[in-house]
Amino acid sequence: MNGRVDYLVTEEEINLTRGPSGLGFNIVGGTDQQYVSNDSGIYVSRIKENGAAALDGRLQEGDKILSVNGQDLKNLLHQDAVDLFRNAGYAVSLRVQHRLQVQNGPIGHRGEGDPSG
């Protein structure tokens, strides 16, 4: 019997200082570039080596960025989201959603990764 894959979703506020080469990551998503089915949100697709995000260490590929400096990223065109980051200033506050994959044991049995009970 196959194990069940669950996701643990957490949110975090990440404050980055723009480095000499910028913030140091790529994004995908937007209303005109849906990366996840039925979700026009903005996701991190690449963390650049030695960039500000990589050196900070908290932002991860696959994270969903919910807001930039308090501005919601819902219902934005892809390029508008890119421009928002580029114009965000020196100190940039990101509200992000991490989605951690949790592998549980077979259905009907409690596996090591299952906190229930």
Epitope: L23, N26, I27, V28, Q33, Y35, S45, H78, V82
Partner: nanobody, 127 residues
Amino acid sequence: EVQLVESGGGLVQAGGSLRLSCAASGRTFSTYTMAWFRQAPGKEREFVAAISWNGGSTYYADSVKGRFTIFRDNAKNMVYLQMNNLKPEDTAVYYCAAAIGSTVDSYDPGDPLEYDYWGQGTQVTVS
């Protein structure tokens, strides 16, 4: 893991044309920023052209402007380089490159560090 496979290279006379193709793996090809670079023997890898995820923006090296055209077909996971009026100095191995998504920083299409994935290359020889 993204895989890129170039094809379409060959031997052509000066003034002739070739169309290079790059086939990319991955279900999210439509989010990739794509580029072509080239490397001649004994020289450094040189930027040729790049194209944004939806084809809305294209970028060219001065040496190929007006002769080369980059375009893509997201339905087929393909990017192309149409090369016209070829010159002997265009002789090189041509490489396809990809970055997943768009940088949130200022984009330098000619910087190889902008791209994560590279093909093995296809030889173009202009006699």
